[in-house]
């Protein structure tokens, strides 16, 4: 009976220790889960920061290139004569002429070529902003140097370069095929596709004369 | 004795369980330490990335300022020898700017003044021909620098000189009297009189920089 009591006491102690240990394990388990969660959040934060850093690097690279170009232009621009001929508009590195006659796309192209220029090419959102502003007081369409043979072909500028998809959406007769091809015009700030055979105003463009004399 | 054996057996079981739990706690403790270490590494990584991002932002800001300075310089340098500033049209001895906003006559006049210019003045039929051609693709009205207080007063340009009668006929509200005066606008090649309080586009004009370089 004495032995039995002793054993019972030990047993109670052990049960108490076991319960205590189980409680510790449960607490550690919760802590572990919280730690895992926190770790996942940290990893997510790292991913976000890494992405942001990558984006910043890209932006910086772009700014750096812009900088180099500006420095180059600045070198050229020192001591130069008229950047553009009379009646043309000088903007940034280009000269623009808004035609005063209405012609089909091919004829408009020829008119520009005779002036040592090409039909309008939009390279950036800044170019687009300028043109949209320059034609803001007109409700007429203006041919630009963008065309394609049919809907299965890409939109190409006169120099053969493709249209950057983010620049603008082309509306209108985009799904149409015409014997003379499909050409793009800009009107009230939006770009439309239409039969190249139609007569419209146009915008000629050429490099501004920013060379050192 | 039977009870005693049973208790001993339970005690053995409990001891075994206790040892097992202690082992688990020890393992979890090690895992926790490793997790803590890994978390510290992640935090360190975050700190590094955040620092790098901050540095990149500073560099980018610097590049951006450099860029703005270069653009500013480019505009200044380029304007030195160019007959007209960017976005203006050079024709003969003048520079012309077609406003991109719609304002009343007085506000339009102020806008031109802020650009070191005046509202359009037509001195000759050649000037008129150029302007008519330049706005041929617009159906909107453009204020010019011609106004009069009421029908008993003569039409005067901004510089106080009178309108040459042979240049053009003024149509529209010629016999009307308005508290703000009567102003002239050009639209589709014809000149009209209207209440100066109305909003319209406008044409600014200033002398071209044709000094010997």
């Amino acid at each position: 009976s004495q032995v039995s009591n002793l054993l019972k006491q030990q047993q109670t102690n052990l049960t108490h220790q076991k319960n205590k240990l189980e409680g510790q394990i449960s607490a550690r388990q919760q802590a572990e889960e919280a730690s895992q969660e926190s770790q996942n959040e940290l990893k997510e934060m790292i991913e976000t920061l890494a992405w942001k850093l990558n984006e910043k690097s890209k932006e910086q690279m772009e700014l750096h290139h812009q900088n180099l170009n500006l420095q180059e232009t600045l070198k050229r621009v020192a001591n130069c004569s008229a950047p553009c001929p009379q009646d043309w508009i000088w903007h940034e590195e280009n000269c623009y002429l808004f035609s005063t006659g209405s012609f089909n796309w091919e004829k408009s192209q020829e008119k520009c070529l005779s002036l040592d220029a090409k039909l309008l090419k939009i390279n950036s959102t800044a170019d687009l902003d300028f043109i949209q502003q320059a034609i803001s007081y007109s409700s007429f369409p203006f041919w630009m140097g963008l065309s394609r043979r049919n809907p299965s072909y890409p939109w190409l500028w006169e120099d053969g370069s493709p249209l950057m998809p983010h620049l603008f959406r082309i509306r209108g007769a985009v799904s149409q095929t015409y014997p003379s091809g499909t050409c793009a015009y800009i009107q009230r700030g939006a770009v439309y596709a239409e039969n190249c055979i139609l007569a419209a105003f146009s915008i000629c463009q050429k490099k501004a004369n920013l060379r050192a004399q | 004795s039977q009870v005693s054996n049973l208790l001993k057996q339970q005690q053995t079981n409990l001891t075994h369980q206790k040892n097992k739990l202690e082992g688990q706690i020890s393992a979890r403790q090690q895992a926790e330490e490793a997790s803590q270490e890994s978390q510290n590494e992640l935090k360190e990584m975050i700190e590094t990335l955040a620092w790098k991002l901050n540095e990149k932002s500073k560099e980018q800001m610097e590049l951006h300022h450099q860029n703005l300075n270069l653009q500013e310089t480019l505009k200044r340098v380029a304007n030195c020898s160019a007959p007209c500033p960017q976005d203006w049209i050079w024709h003969e001895e003048n520079c012309y700017l077609f406003s991109t906003g719609s304002f009343n006559w007085e506000k339009s006049q102020e806008k031109c003044l802020s650009l070191d210019a005046k509202l359009l003045k037509i001195n000759s039929t050649a000037d008129l021909d150029f302007i008519q051609q330049a706005i041929s693709y617009s159906s909107f009205p453009f204020w010019m620098g011609l106004s009069r207080r009421n029908p008993s007063y003569p039409w005067l340009w901004e510089d106080g000189s009178p309108l040459m009668p042979h240049l053009f006929r003024i149509r529209g509200a010629v016999s009307q009297t308005y508290p703000s005066g009567t102003c002239a606008y050009i639209q589709r090649g014809a000149v009209y009189a209207e209440n100066c309080i109305l909003a319209a586009f406008s044409i600014c004009q200033k002398k071209a920089n044709l000094r010997a370089q």
């Epitope: 007769a173 149409q176 095929t177 015409y178 009107q187 239409e194 039969n195 055979i197 139609l198 | -």
Partner: antibody, heavy 119, light 111 residues
Framework: QVQLLESGGGLVQPGGSLRLSCAAS????????LHWVRQAPGKGLEWVSV????????YYADSVKGRFTISRDNSKNTLYLQMNSLRAEDTAVYYC????????????WGQGTLVTVSS | DIVLTQPPSVSGAPGQRVTISCSGS????????VSWYQQLPGTAPKLLIH???HRPSGVPDRFSGSKSGTSASLAITGLQAEDEADYYC???????????FGGGTKLTVLG
């Protein structure tokens, strides 16, 4: 589905005016060129006018030039034809039709509205 | 002033093949596409063929279009009673800058 619904027809005296409307639904209105085509009683189809997506290109048949004006309101999805100085020979059923391109085919037509010019 | 020339009428028995011609010039059919429309009595015209030979969905393949030089033609095979209608050709004339229609052809299904 695509729907074009003309209205505004009726009896008018020679020299009078009338304004036709064509309400469109079931498609992106501003992505299509719109035409007016008429048909005199017992006769064939005669094209009247076309207007491009934003009204930049507008063309008329010689028979209506200077008298008729085509317009559109993209915010209201509606095409209009303002007819002035009407003549007996303008008597016809007037259809509005949509085109995916200004010079291309008419893939949808309205049911038509009758204009009668008579004294 | 009809610019595109069509025969005023054509006829054929059920099951037969008929063709409708459309003659133009270099400024319309010669340099642009041709479309064909069917107009059943008392209804609005319906597009049958576009871009010379393309059939919109829902148009039976008994209808076909072709173009050669300054002329175009519409062929209908396996003629059916419900094909009895007026048929019009259409193109764009770039010289006069307008849409041009043919005078229309009345198709009669005999029998």
């Amino acid at each position: 589905q695509v729907q074009l619904l003309e209205s505004g027809g009726g009896l008018v005296q020679p020299g009078g005016s009338l304004r036709l409307s064509c309400a469109a639904s079931g498609f992106t209105f501003s992505d299509y060129a719109l035409h007016w085509v008429r048909q005199a009683p017992g006769k064939g189809l005669e094209w009247v006018s076309v207007i491009s997506y934003q009204g930049g290109f507008i063309y008329y048949a010689d028979s209506v030039k200077g008298r008729f004006t085509i317009s559109r309101d993209n915010s209201k999805n509606t095409l209009y034809l303002q007819m002035n100085s009407l003549r007996a020979e303008d008597t016809a059923v007037y259809y509005c039709a949509r085109s995916p391109g200004l010079t291309s085919y008419h893939d949808s037509w309205g049911q038509g509205t009758l204009v009668t010019v008579s004294s | 002033d009809i610019v595109l020339t069509q025969p005023p009428s054509v006829s054929g028995a059920p099951g037969q093949r008929v063709t409708i011609s459309c003659s133009g010039s270099s400024s319309n059919i010669g340099s642009n596409y041709v479309s064909w429309y069917q107009q059943l009595p008392g209804t609005a015209p319906k597009l049958l063929i576009h871009s010379n030979s393309h059939r919109p969905s829902g148009v039976p393949d008994r209808f076909s279009g072709s173009k050669s030089g300054t002329s175009a033609s519409l062929a209908i095979t396996g003629l059916q009673a419900e094909d009895e209608a007026d048929y019009y050709c259409q193109s764009w004339d770039y010289e006069s800058e307008r849409v041009v229609f043919g005078g229309g052809t009345k198709l009669t299904v005999l029998g």
